[in-house]
């Protein structure tokens, strides 16, 4: 149509200028489009330079939209993480504060002269919770051994107890059960509770981290071309009012985000495992009950030691021989009053229930995040046509969009008509993140069964997917027992940059 050749480019000028580009590039009227490399080559208001500028802009706009969607999800996960972390740390800090307030009165010098051992125990529990790869059972065993040495010595000031005698006492301890059932009970319950708490919070950290890393994956050149065609070619071809057809937009974004959609299965598995492990937060071995009540197990242990003192001493002498008597030492310590403490079962505060129900709801809401992303971006960011009619932009002209909508994920893009996707070349960053999701899911499943597993990073770029400074300086190299020489390995997923190290205390 000869009349159309001289159609004005006013509308395109307006749109192009509004995007901050120089208007000197824009023709006054349509020109022949043989120079176009992305848009159909009919009459056009776009020069080569304009097409390139708009292609770069559409690419940047999609990446921004993608990052915005990711940021919302990241913010939700970070808020959840902080809330749970604050709560769990609060429980442990409360227990330590209660111990510091009640033990001096309850146990006198048996506590005050051993305060550091108790402080160290809480410090190590905090480290363990925050992701340090230490062996909790070993940590507890070391604490009891250390405490026994000192308490036994305090309870028998009339005896000379050199290091070699204390070594023998230590070897006998397991069979003698000097602290009664408390160490065993604390070990079983604390292991389950701390494993559940830390793996849940780590799960939130890993999920957030995966979202952050995936949001940084660049969109390929084929995607850029397809997005340009989707968003701006209608302007270049003189139909600026035509909005993209919904199915057309979906195919473009399913092609562009094919690798991201492959996260779906493992993402769902992770979130399911996180929801499942919240079951372990309740009951007598639950997180709230145990972490907040560590001090009551410690009190029971000291009471048991005092109650069993005479029997214990007889058995120790039987196993280790008669220690020398300290001629100038006083007689045996008088039996102290039993340390009376609040009952072990903490009434639930209600805080955790509220946190869990909110978390479950929010985790369910984001389960299909990756596969719903193309649809979400199309409906929220792409100003789609309201219906698949013959008035929408189909990539070539105004008209109906006929191709079927592709399935989700890389393999389903083999025949995507809008984006040329090489299904034999999956994105390596995303593959690594899929692996991180798998690792974390396995950890959560082990934690559900009460087991802790070594948490090694499976990514092969050396960067892992730890979320920043969760391991303050080298918190993650675990304390090596004096009794063993096992090495401790750093964790990839220590808690992401949360609580400051307990650090400095002043006498």
């Amino acid at each position: 149509d000869p009349a159309s050749k001289s159609r004005s480019c006013g509308e395109v000028r307006q749109i192009y200028g509004a995007k901050g580009f120089s208007l000197s590039d824009v023709p006054q009227a349509e020109i022949s489009g043989e120079h176009l490399r992305i848009c159909p080559q009919g009459y056009t208001c776009c020069t080569s330079e304009m097409e390139e500028n708009l292609a770069n802009r559409s690419h940047a706009e999609l990446e921004t939209a993608l990052r915005d969607s990711s940021r919302v999800l990241q913010a939700m996960l970070a808020t959840q993480l902080r809330s749970f972390d604050d709560h769990f740390q609060h429980l442990l800090n409360d227990s330590e504060r209660t111990l510091q307030a009640t033990f001096p009165g309850a146990f006198g010098e048996l506590y005050t002269q051993n305060a550091r051992a108790f402080r160290d125990l809480y410090s190590e529990l905090r480290l363990y919770y925050r992701g340090a790869n230490l062996h909790l059972e070993e940590t507890l065993a070391e604490f009891w051994a250390r405490l026994l040495e000192r308490l036994f010595k305090q309870l028998h000031p009339q005896l000379l107890l050199p290091d070699d005698y204390l070594d023998c006492l230590g070897k006998q301890a397991e069979a003698l059960r000097p602290f009664g059932e408390a160490p065993r009970e604390l070990r079983l319950r604390a292991t389950r509770a701390f494993v559940a708490a830390r793996s849940f919070v780590q799960g939130l950290g890993v999920a957030s981290d995966v979202v952050r890393k995936v949001a940084q994956v660049p969109l390929g050149p084929e995607c850029s071309r397809a997005v340009m065609k989707l968003v701006y070619c209608a302007h270049c071809l003189g139909v600026p009012g035509a909005r993209p057809c919904p199915d057309y937009c979906r195919n473009v974004l399913k092609g562009c985000l094919a690798n991201q959609a492959d996260l779906d299965a493992e993402w769902r598995n992770l979130l399911d495992s996180m929801v499942l492990i919240t079951d372990k937060f309740w009951g007598t071995s639950g997180v709230e009950s145990v972490i907040g009540s560590v001090h009551t197990w410690l009190a029971e242990a000291i009471n048991a030691l005092q109650d069993n003192r005479d029997t214990l001493t007889a058995k120790v002498i039987q196993g280790c021989g008669n220690p020398k008597v300290n001629p100038q030492g006083p007689g045996p310590e008088e039996k102290r009053r039993r340390g009376k403490l609040a009952p072990r079962e903490r009434p639930p505060s209600g805080t955790l229930e509220k946190l869990v129900s909110e978390a479950k709801a929010q985790l369910r809401d984001v389960q299909d995040f990756w596969i719903s992303l193309p649809g979400t971006l199309c409906s929220e960011k792409m100003a789609l046509s309201t219906a698949s009619d013959d008035r929408c932009w189909n990539g070539m002209a105004r008209g109906r969009y006929l191709p079927e909508v592709m399935g989700d994920g890389l393999a389903n893009q083999i025949n995507n008509p809008e984006v040329e996707v090489d299904i034999t070349k999956p994105d390596m960053t995303i593959r690594q993140q899929i692996m991180q999701l798998k690792i974390m899911t396995n950890r959560l499943r082990s934690a559900y069964n009460g087991n802790d597993v070594d948490f090694q990073d499976a990514s092969d770029d050396g960067s892992g997917s730890g979320s920043g400074d969760g391991c303050l300086d080298d918190l993650c190299s675990r304390k090596v027992s004096r009794k063993s020489s096992s090495s401790r390995t750093p964790l990839t997923h220590a808690l992401p940059g949360l609580s400051e190290q307990e650090g400095q205390k002043t006498s």
Epitope: E149, L166, R482
Partner: antibody, heavy 119, light 107 residues
Framework: QVQLVQSGAEVKKPGASVKVSCKAS????????MHWVRQAPGQGLEWMGE????????TYNQKFKARVTMTRDTSTSTVYMELSSLRSEDTAVYYC????????????WGQGTLVTVSS | DIVMTQSPSTLSASVGDRVTIICRAS??????LAWYQQKSGKAPKLLIY???NLQSGVPSRFSGSGYGTDFTLTISSLQPEDFATYYC?????????FGPGTKVDIK
């Protein structure tokens, strides 16, 4: 065998800071508390503070709290003691000392580092 | 803080003498007391821990006793190499304070 090797003597001006190192060998570094003790010329021993190399937790003598920082590097089995805002009365030999068995008893000592504060 | 005192501050003795140094704590420290020997220009050396236990490698002429607040270091027969300064230290709780020292010199 257990060895604690300290850094060399330092001469500092009043108001400056000094950082003394203590490299440990012959045992599991993270298994025992490390302490710093100082001794002014002709004076007695003064406990400055301790660090748990496993956790990095520190406890300082109140007298030095505002000026002392103890840190550790587990990769090199080294502890550090930094004292800031030095004054002439900080002239002393500074010792690092390792506990015997979680008991506050110092069975192993470094050779000492003389820090002289003089204008 | 727990304050440690020692007496005497200086002690003149001869080789072969029996020497006793007393250390007192401002509050009960149970059995948590250590004794150190220091010679001029050297780092201190641990002699006794837990109030009465002899550190490995230390001659048996050194002995310690006491509990709570009152402690004693005894050298049963003073040898030439024993002329030095002796410090007590409470190991009950931080800050791990030292006594002011007792100098044992030749009479």
């Amino acid at each position: 065998q257990v060895q604690l090797v300290q850094s060399g003597a330092e001469v500092k001006k009043p108001g400056a800071s000094v950082k003394v190192s203590c490299k440990a060998s012959g045992y599991t570094f993270t298994g025992y508390y490390m302490h710093w003790v100082r001794q002014a010329p002709g004076q007695g021993l003064e406990w400055m503070g301790e660090i748990n190399p496993s956790t990095g937790d520190t406890t300082y003598n109140q007298k030095f709290k505002a000026r002392v920082t103890m840190t550790r590097d587990t990769s090199t089995s080294t502890v550090y003691m930094e004292l800031s805002s030095l004054r002439s009365e900080d002239t002393a030999v500074y010792y690092c000392a390792r506990e015997k068995r979680d008991d506050g008893v110092f069975a192993y000592w470094g050779q000492g580092t003389l820090v002289t504060v003089s204008s | 803080d727990i304050v440690m005192t020692q007496s005497p501050s200086t002690l003149s003795a001869s080789v072969g003498d029996r020497v006793t140094i007393i250390c007192r704590a401002s509050q009960s420290i149970g059995p948590w007391l250590a004794w150190y020997q220091q010679k001029s220009g050297k780092a201190p050396k641990l002699l006794i821990y837990g109030a009465s236990n002899l550190q490995s490698g230390v001659p048996s002429r050194f002995s310690g006793s006491g509990y709570g607040t009152d402690f004693t270091l005894t050298i049963s027969s003073l040898q030439p190499e024993d002329f030095a300064t002796y410090y007590c230290q409470q190991t009950s709780s931080a800050p791990f304070t030292f006594g002011p020292g007792t100098k044992v010199d030749i009479k």
